[in-house]
């Protein structure tokens, strides 16, 4: 903590301006009034403060606003945002997308994924739902940030907004997030024709159930292998060799180069070897001819 001292009369601060860069840490602490700082936050980012000086300014704001900063201050944090922890941000109530844009710009190029995720979460809470304007802001200023939201937050996305989401915005989404987004996407794109539907739904397919994947295999879609490998393991395992062949089309060739990676590896282990041989890929590890497959999970469920 910064040592408390009294402010020398000649150092008294009446304006937040460039003269402050010559103040030592203890002088800033003693001479800058927190309320003045809050009122003139818009000036702070134009002044080349050191990180140590910014620490002092943050400390003053924390004392003034122990329950969390007001949005008028948050909007003008500028590089002071780099000093915020997720715990600090959790106290905020943010509703303005201009505030979000300003802070996303500041965070670019810095390792602040946890802070940014928390900030986005606060914006969604503050606005009541993940509306189109918020999604547009995220896709424009923070590609991939959509996936930093929890499944609970993502559940507030109306299906009408899904069309604004681009494939690259979903690259870092995990299975639980795609489980939430997929049904919304299915609803949003339901009136599209086959090939157009597939192009749109493709980034969301990591949340698709087996029956939807089977249905796609009947539609001549030629799913690329990267998309196939993002499917849920439970959705892939029940597929037959013929269904996978139809689903992937020419891309089925890629199973050979990815045969050691899940879900390809797990799927191979469940197929009959002579069925795998029809793919013309030299895939090994299937169930040998003449072996009987017992599904013990059924017996366990009955007992």
């Amino acid at each position: 903590d910064v040592e408390r001292t009294t402010c020398p009369p000649e150092k008294e601060v009446h304006e937040i301006d460039e003269s402050l860069i010559f103040y030592k840490k203890r002088e800033l602490e003693a001479c800058v009034d927190a309320a003045l700082l809050a009122a003139q936050m818009d000036r702070v980012d134009a002044i080349p403060f050191t990180y140590e000086q910014l620490d002092v300014l943050k400390h003053k704001l924390d004392e003034l606003y122990p329950q969390g900063y007001p949005e008028s201050v948050i909007r003008h944090l500028g590089h002071l945002f780099l000093k915020m922890s997720p715990e600090d941000i959790r106290k905020w109530n943010v509703t303005s997308l201009e505030t979000l844009k300003a802070l996303l710009k500041v965070s670019k190029g810095h390792e602040m994924s946890a802070q940014v995720a928390t900030l986005i979460d606060r914006v969604v809470v503050g606005r009541g739902q993940l509306d189109k304007d918020t999604v547009d802001t995220l896709t424009a200023f923070c590609p991939g940030c959509l996936c930093s939201l929890s499944p609970e937050r993502l559940s507030s996305v109306p299906p009408s907004v899904i069309g604004a989401v681009r494939p690259q915005d979903l690259d870092t989404c995990g299975p639980r997030q795609l489980d939430v987004l997929y049904p919304k996407a299915r609803l949003a794109f339901q009136n599209m024709s086959g090939s157009e539907y597939f192009v749109k739904i493709r980034p969301f397919l990591g949340g698709a159930p087996t029956e939807d994947v089977k249905a796609l295999s009947q539609q001549n879609v030629s799913m690329d292998l990267a998309t196939f490998m993002k499917l849920r393991r439970e959705a892939v395992l029940p597929l037959t060799v013929a269904e996978v062949q139809k689903l992937l089309g020419p891309h089925v060739e890629g199973l050979k180069v990815e045969e050691q990676h899940s879900p390809v590896r797990d799927w191979i282990l469940k197929q009959r070897q002579d069925d795998l041989d029809t793919l013309g890929l030299g895939l090994q590890g299937g169930i040998p001819n003449g072996y009987l497959i017992l599904d013990l999970s059924v017996r366990e469920a009955l007992s």
Partner: antibody, heavy 117, light 113 residues
């Protein structure tokens, strides 16, 4: 040693068809897909399609969809590519290439097809 | 279709010097599950068929001299010849095998200065 030996050069008239063969040796023919790629004089490479020699399933670049047919004869380990309704812009060297997974690991020597009236 | 853009179109390099060829794809070639980039590099010497140099963006095909190396991920890739030899005079092509139709770059002609 993997070898892909293609049939000889052909001269065809516009509107005719050409069938190029590619005889494979030195590996298990049904374990690797065969691709066909063409190269117009002084130009780059263009992927035409691929075929699964085990099942005979073939997939074509949409640009050639209505004119190309790829087949295999497992008994002779030979792949074929037939292109119909030839036009002057089909003048090119046609290559067969054995897949190494997805990439093209081994290439035939190429077959020059000249389309001229 | 995925568009592959190679640069430069041609390159003149002194013997023993480094040659660098760039390849840019219009969309990512990264399989984020396996972390494999579906990009290959081929060499085509005058009057010959192409031969495979590199696959998965950076894996050298067996028998390819170690002066050839590939790097990059996502949409930006590079083929480097660390010390150009006379026998490296050729046209070099990148190719994506992420999504059909598999497409090639326009080629880069490498000559000796």
């Amino acid at each position: 040693e993997v070898q892909l030996v293609q049939s000889g050069a052909e001269v065809k008239k516009p509107g005719a068809s050409v069938k190029v063969s590619c005889k494979a040796s030195g590996y298990t023919f049904t374990n690797y897909w065969m691709h066909w790629v063409r190269q117009a004089p002084g130009q780059g490479l263009e992927w035409m399609g691929n075929i699964n020699p085990s099942s005979g399933d073939s997939y074509y670049n949409e640009r050639f969809m209505s004119r190309v047919t790829m087949t295999v004869d497992k008994s002779t380990s030979t792949a074929y590519m037939e292109l119909s309704s030839l036009r002057s812009e089909d003048t090119a060297v046609y290559y067969c290439a054995r897949s190494g997974g997805l990439w093209l690991a081994f290439w035939g020597q190429g077959t020059l097809v000249t389309v001229s009236s | 279709d995925i568009v592959m853009t190679q640069s430069p179109d041609s390159l003149a390099v002194s013997l023993g010097e480094r040659a660098t060829i760039n390849c840019k794809s219009s969309q990512t070639l990264l399989n984020s599950v396996s972390q494999n980039n579906y990009l290959a590099w081929y060499q085509q010497k005058p009057g010959q068929s192409p031969t495979l140099l590199i696959y998965f963006a950076s894996t050298r095909e067996s028998g390819v001299p170690d002066r050839f190396s590939g790097s990059g991920s996502g949409t930006d890739f590079t083929l480097t010849i660390s010390s150009l030899q006379a026998e490296d005079v050729a046209v070099y092509y990148c190719q994506q095998h992420y999504r059909t139709p598999y497409t090639f770059g326009g080629g880069t002609k490498v000559e000796i200065k």
